[in-house]
């Protein structure tokens, strides 16, 4: 009898533990933002990408804020940040201005309290995209572990925005909290 009661108590304690873990996990901030293809800037210069989806398709956000093209941190912590940017061109969409391209992404952190901006990650390459080739494609993926404070903002800059692949599985960025700051 007593064995049965102990087992039952353990089950109850375990489920409370699971529930506590689950609620803590649910409170863990995360975001996965996908490019808004209707509002991609044109040209070849470096620009900040301000139009992202946060609530459709693969895009989701929880306990973080998306505002004015920036992902805003609501909780201090160590976060894993990532970005995937795809560039593509098909001759049916027009000509390339130049065959020599610098295709880059910059993940930037901006602090409002102490006005400052830092590039956290960058990636890319110089490419030769011949005008005689029918199709071109290039993908950049960057990721890293960073200490972020509440109120800090994450934004994405790219070169050659007119060459961005507008699909949700191609151009996206995100963050998730891994642990608290001790």
């Amino acid at each position: 009898g007593s064995q049965h009661i102990r087992a039952e108590k353990a089950m109850v304690d375990g489920s409370w533990l699971d529930l506590a873990k689950r609620s803590k996990l649910e409170a863990q901030p995360f975001a996965h933002l996908t490019i808004n293809a209707t509002d991609i800037p044109s040209g070849s210069h470096k620009v900040s990408l301000s139009s992202w989806y946060h609530d459709r398709g693969w895009a989701k956000i929880s306990n973080m804020t998306f505002s004015n093209g920036k992902l805003i941190v609501n909780q201090d912590g160590f976060y894993y940040l990532y970005a995937n940017i795809c560039f593509r061109h098909h001759e049916t969409s027009g000509d390339l201005a130049t065959e020599y391209l610098q295709l880059m992404v910059y993940v930037t952190k901006t602090s409002i309290k102490i006005p400052s901006s830092h590039t956290l990650m960058k990636g890319g390459s110089t490419k030769y995209w011949s005008g005689n080739s029918e199709f071109h494609f290039y993908s950049i993926n960057v990721g890293g572990f960073f200490k972020l404070r509440s109120g800090e903002e994450i934004s994405i800059e790219v070169s050659n925005p007119s060459l961005l692949d507008p699909d949700q599985d191609a151009t996206y960025f995100g963050a998730f909290k891994v642990r608290d700051i001790d």
Epitope: S42, G43, S44, T92, G94, D95, A97, T98, N132
Partner: antibody, heavy 118, light 111 residues
């Protein structure tokens, strides 16, 4: 539909300059090279050069490089070509043109006749 | 510069027969698995019209009587069967390499 409309005929004296225009419509002006081709009376076609209107990148045939300039006004979706130090052998019909969605020049302006005569 | 030599300079073909025009390039116009050679028809007082692009592709709206073939340096435009409306001058053009160049033209007369 893609349309290229060129300015009217010009009569010029040797040594003078001429500036022709080509107004594009029916497509995004800043996404294709716009080309210039000329044809002297009874002669064949001669490719002169091209401009990529956004950043204004240009390419020219060596023969014309010193006295030929192509420009573009993106706000007017219009390209211009200027030929300086005109000679009688510059008398020709001048066409602006654009490639098709694949390759080859699928779209042509109606042509502008330039006559160089003393 | 790539020089394109067309032959013959002129030809006369009977109605319903086959017309063949040749274009030879001074160097290969092939790259990335494609041949950057195109064919145009021009009637007097009119701008040229694109017939064939990338050596063998028929431009939209062009009758199937027109066909193109060839690769690297040797290309052919074939009109079969020839119709009265085909009397015109035909040009080849390459855009594999700047500056783009045209052939000298072939004048087709219908007998």
């Amino acid at each position: 539909q893609v349309q290229l409309v060129q300015s009217g005929a010009e009569l010029k004296k040797p040594g003078a300059s001429v500036k022709l225009s080509c107004k594009a419509s029916g497509y995004t002006f800043t996404t294709y090279w716009l080309q210039w081709v000329r044809q002297a009376p009874g002669q064949g076609l001669e490719w002169m050069g091209a401009i990529y209107p956004g950043p204004g990148n240009t390419k020219y045939t060596q023969k014309f490089k010193d006295r030929f300039t192509i420009t573009a006004d993106t706000s007017k979706s219009t390209a211009y070509m200027q030929l300086n130090s005109l000679k009688s052998e510059d008398s020709a019909v001048y066409y602006c043109a654009r490639r098709g969605s694949r390759r080859g020049i699928a779209y042509w302006g109606q042509g502008t006749l330039v006559t160089v005569s003393a | 510069n790539i020089v394109l030599t067309q032959s013959p300079a002129s030809l006369a073909v009977s109605l319903g027969q086959r017309a063949t025009i040749s274009c030879r390039a001074s160097e290969s116009v092939d790259s990335y698995g494609r041949s950057f050679m195109h064919w145009y028809q021009q009637r007097p007082g009119q701008p040229p019209t694109l017939l064939i692009y990338l050596a063998s592709n028929l431009e939209s709206g062009v009758p199937v009587r027109f066909s193109g073939s060839g690769s690297r340096t040797d290309f052919t435009l074939t009109i079969d069967p020839v119709e009265a409306d085909d009397a015109a001058t035909y040009y080849c053009q390459q855009d594999n390499e700047d500056p783009y160049t045209f052939g000298g033209g072939t004048k087709l007369e219908i007998k």
